[in-house]
């Protein structure tokens, strides 16, 4: 049996930051789980991991240099990504794995979310002209 | 039996234009076919159509306002999209349908191509200071 995952089809990060909510057809309350976010059509880059355990505080980390935080709901995990670069525009897939209690469960591959990082395009300030001569 | 389609995982349109090549596991020579390009995770927008017929010239059109051209290879169709907007950054899927000879054939859904439209972000020129006074 597979968990189903819902994600927004597209999100735009105007200020180099975005909240991506992964909604699951499964209640994570009092479960040991690993929720992760993967970048690219081949899901090659693991962007962020949220590890949850009924007895411990939520642990959030990235092994790939992303600035990431996570928030847990009963049937969702929201990834908060900051300091994104324009060239990190890509498709991002939510993944969920339940390790305890058995049996191990994971999700059907989701459709993904296109994150379009618009960033801030800063133009150089014109040179300060200085005081005009009399 | 389904045709397999290969596309680049990602393309960046720096100058608001891009060539997207759809490669098929099928030879289109002397076939009547309809090759199309679809935008979005739900493929909701048909961006461009290339219609080919053994007896006629290739016909290329867009019903959705895209500036599009197409080029045919034996086992490929290349879509050339111009005048793309930054907010048209999305995932694009190639589709191929062979109408003649029977039987009708189409493709397994491809992985798609993320087209990241970077566009040209023009900064205003600094005001021309004019000649300095003696």
């Amino acid at each position: 049996n597979k968990i189903l995952v819902k994600q927004s089809p597209m999100l735009v990060a105007y200020d180099n930051a975005v909240n991506l909510s992964c909604k699951y057809s499964y209640n994570l309350f009092s479960r040991e789980f690993r929720a992760s976010l993967h970048k690219g059509l081949d899901s090659a880059v693991e962007v962020c991991v949220v590890y949850g355990n009924y007895s411990q505080q939520l642990q959030v980390y990235s092994k790939t240099g992303f600035n990431c935080d996570g928030k847990l709901g009963n049937e969702s995990v929201t990834f908060y990504l900051q300091n994104l670069y324009v060239n990190q525009t890509d498709i991002y897939f939510c993944k969920i794995e339940v390790m305890y209690p058995p049996p191990y469960l994971d999700n059907e591959k989701s459709n993904g979310t296109i994150i379009h990082v618009k960033g801030k395009h800063l133009c150089p300030s014109p040179l300060f002209p200085g005081p005009s001569k009399p | 039996n389904k045709i397999l389609v290969k596309q680049s995982p990602m393309l960046v349109a720096y100058d608001n234009a891009v060539n997207l090549s759809c490669k098929y596991s099928y030879n289109l020579f002397s076939r009547e076919f309809r090759a199309s390009l679809h935008k979005g995770l739900d493929s909701a927008v048909e961006v461009c159509v290339v219609y080919g017929n053994y007896s006629q010239q290739l016909q290329v059109y867009s019903k959705t306002g895209f500036n599009c051209d197409g080029k045919l290879g034996n086992e490929s169709v290349t879509f050339y999209l111009q005048n793309l907007y930054v907010n048209q950054t999305d995932i694009y899927f190639c589709k191929i349908e062979v109408m003649y000879p029977p039987p009708y054939l189409d493709n397994e859904k491809s992985n798609g191509t993320i087209i990241h439209v970077k566009g040209k972000h023009l900064c205003p020129s600094p005001l021309f200071p004019g000649p300095s006074k003696p």
Partner: antibody
Framework: EVQLVESGGGLVQPGGSLRLSCAAS????????IHWVRQAPGKGLEWVAS????????RYADSVKGRFTISADTSKNTAYLQMNSLRAEDTAVYYC?????????????WGQGTTVTVSS | DIQMTQSPSSLSASVGDRVTITCHAS??????LNWYQQKPGKAPKLLIY???NLHTGVPSRFSGSGSGTDFTLTISSLQPEDFATYYC?????????FGGGTKVEIK
Amino acid sequence: EVQLVESGGGLVQPGGSLRLSCAASGFTFTSYYIHWVRQAPGKGLEWVASIYPGNVATRYADSVKGRFTISADTSKNTAYLQMNSLRAEDTAVYYCTRSHYGLDWNFDVWGQGTTVTVSS
Amino acid sequence: DIQMTQSPSSLSASVGDRVTITCHASQNIYVWLNWYQQKPGKAPKLLIYKASNLHTGVPSRFSGSGSGTDFTLTISSLQPEDFATYYCQQGQTYPYTFGGGTKVEIK
């Protein structure tokens, strides 16, 4: 010669059923959509349904969804419109027409039409 | 659904007159607009496709123009066989929709 010939029209009571046929000849059936377009007495044209015989993909107008079924038999080059739960407002001349699957935007060949009257 | 509005709904004209019929789409349909002629008791016939292209066998006195939301069918010099009802139809998005028709009558 390219031809579309409709048949199967007639008088039927409200709630009744009827099946219309459209026999195609003179062109490659799997290169075209087959459509049904109707015209109520003294009224304009209304697109009803379409089928692409190649992959049997169908579309319907909201006004007939769930009541009408379009189908096609490629061995006979014939399309059908099965009309169930007929209402007085379905009374019309029903035309069979085609549009090209690769170049789909206009109806270039029409049948002569078949009349459906729904009345008690 | 895209609404197609034709005007006028009817007009009276004489042989030799220049006749103009307009069609308005409720949203941008680019050039995906077709015109048909229908005579009483007969099936419609395609006249113009993609806004301005004359269908095979249609006399050159018929012409079409426009793009976006506003389109025009012009008959440059009305002939006796042109007295009929004319319909516009959008072919951009399903469901394909028709205008209400314009009946061209003899003055």
